[in-house]
């Protein structure tokens, strides 16, 4: 049976959701040896109904809030080993907020809060713009929100300010929330590595390009800023 007399350790990790895509809100707990003794409840600050409930080995969604209907799941196969993470389908801007992962097992009960940020972030791609009159690089990233900053850097001219020789534009995407980021860097020199860095309060992404006489090398990297 479920006693819930003692406190158990529940651990969450602050995370970010990419709107329009599926997200995961991480939560782990001290495992129990019997699935039927585990109850997982996900709650959100300011939301009346439950986000998700999993008990006696299955989802119990009778008290689920309308805004989460048909959009949540847990990794049921992993609950027995202490994984209570919530899967969230089609992340919305309004899903941002403070969530509570509340666990009851035969060993006791415990909870932990999690800050969930939502926005849009994508990997940039840097290309040589052959249509331009001078040597030009074009950095494009399809989906960002909130509006990010774009900074160019180069390996040769470290610390140089490229704002005078670059131009950045933001084009609203069809869903009227996220934006396409396009930044152009002029007067580039050969045998140099240039980096296009896009950043907002959720994510930081970098697209690198190295242009030599014989080849072009590219590399991209994306990092969520609030993930510990």
């Amino acid at each position: 049976g479920i006693s819930g007399r003692h406190s158990i350790t529940v651990t969450t990790v602050a995370s970010a959701g990419n709107i329009g895509e599926d997200g995961i809100l991480s939560c782990t707990f001290e495992p129990d040896i019997k699935l039927s003794d585990i109850v997982i409840q996900w709650l959100k600050e300011g939301v009346l109904g439950l986000v998700h409930e999993f008990k006696e080995g299955k989802d119990e969604l009778s008290e689920q809030d309308e805004m989460f209907r048909g959009r949540t799941a847990v990794f049921a196969d992993q609950v027995i080993v202490g994984n209570a993470s919530l899967r969230l389908k089609n992340v919305q801007l309004t899903d941002a907020g403070t969530y509570k992962c509340y666990i009851i097992t035969s060993k006791g009960k415990g909870n932990a809060n999690l800050e969930y940020k939502t926005g849009a972030f994508s990997m940039p791609e840097v290309n040589v713009d052959y249509n331009a009159s001078s040597e030009t690089l074009r950095c494009e990233a399809p989906r960002w929100f909130p509006q990010p900053t774009v900074v160019w850097a180069s390996q040769v001219d470290q610390g140089a300010n490229f704002s005078e020789v670059s131009n950045t534009s933001f084009e609203l995407n069809s869903e009227n929330v996220t934006m396409k980021v396009v930044s152009v860097l002029y007067n580039v020199t050969i045998n140099n590595t240039y980096s296009c860095m896009i950043e907002n309060d959720i994510a930081k992404a970098t697209g690198d390009i190295k242009v030599t006489e014989s080849e072009i090398k590219r590399r991209s990297h994306l990092q969520l800023l609030n993930s510990k």
């Epitope: 599926d22 040896i33 039927s36 799941a73 847990v74 027995i80 080993v81 899967r87 389908k89």
Partner: antibody, heavy 115, light 107 residues
Framework: QVQLQQSGAELMKPGASVKISCKAS????????MHWVKQSHGKSLEWVGY????????SYNQKFKGKATLTVDKSSSTAYMHLSSLTSEDSGVYYC????????WGQGTLVTVSA | DIVMTQSPSSMYASLGERVTITCKAS??????LSWYQQKPWKSPKTLIY???SLADGVPSRFSGSGSGQDFSLTISSLESDDTATYYC?????????FGGGTKLEIK
């Protein structure tokens, strides 16, 4: 208790295709992966693959890639396995199942491939 | 692929006897192992999940132990209803693989 109800037995000609269904009752369909398992007559069990009802993602045993296609219909809490280009080697009982945790199994669907 | 070697492949035991079936994985699968009981013309029934957890409705005479590569299913006191074929399954790494089965009959 979660019940998994499978469709009835199928007698098929070589070269034909068949689609087997597995309907889950008394639970929300998205938290468990739905696995499919084959049992040839008098033999052990073979894992075919699973479908993740949350996003439709799949994982297959290499042996069944190109032979089996796993899908789900969340609105009816039903999983499907489509078997193509049937040969006598595909004859057997196919089970849908939740493998880990509350591991329930369907009653099985007998597929017989015969000219 | 991970190979699950189950032994014995068949055995006879007396009522009330303690019976142990083993499964050895070709590599570490932690505790990602389940045990199933199958009777003729029936679908498998889960006995043990995650190596040691007893499935709901399964008599307490069944128990599972082990982790890593070596696992066992024990029936503490054999009953006539336990005549069946028993299978282990590793679900630690894709493709999931079953043992060859152990056919258990009463002496």
């Amino acid at each position: 208790q979660v019940q998994l109800q499978q469709s009835g037995a199928e007698l098929m000609k070589p070269g034909a295709s068949v689609k087997i269904s597995c309907k889950a009752s008394d639970y929300s369909f998205t938290s468990y992966y739905m696995h499919w398992v084959k049992q040839s007559h008098g033999k052990s069990l073979e894992w075919v693959g699973y479908v993740d009802p949350f996003n439709g993602g799949t994982s297959y045993n290499q042996k069944f890639k190109g032979k089996a296609t796993l899908t789900v219909d969340k609105s009816s809490s039903t999983a499907y396995m489509h078997l193509s280009s049937l040969t006598s080697e595909d004859s057997g009982v196919y089970y849908c199942a939740f493998i880990a945790g509350f591991a329930n199994w369907g009653q099985g669907t007998l597929v017989t491939v015969s000219a | 692929d991970i190979v699950m070697t189950q032994s014995p492949s068949s055995m006879y035991a007396s009522l009330g006897e303690r019976v142990t079936i083993t499964c050895k994985a070709s590599q570490d699968i932690k505790s990602y192992l389940s045990w199933y009981q199958q009777k003729p013309w029936k679908s498998p029934k889960t006995l043990i999940y995650y190596a040691t957890s007893l499935a709901d409705g399964v008599p307490s005479r069944f128990s599972g132990s082990g982790s890593g590569q070596d696992f066992s299913l024990t029936i503490s006191s054999l009953e006539s209803d336990d005549t069946a074929t028993y299978y282990c399954l590793q679900h630690g790494e894709s493709p999931y693989t079953f043992g060859g089965g152990t056919k258990l009959e009463i002496k």
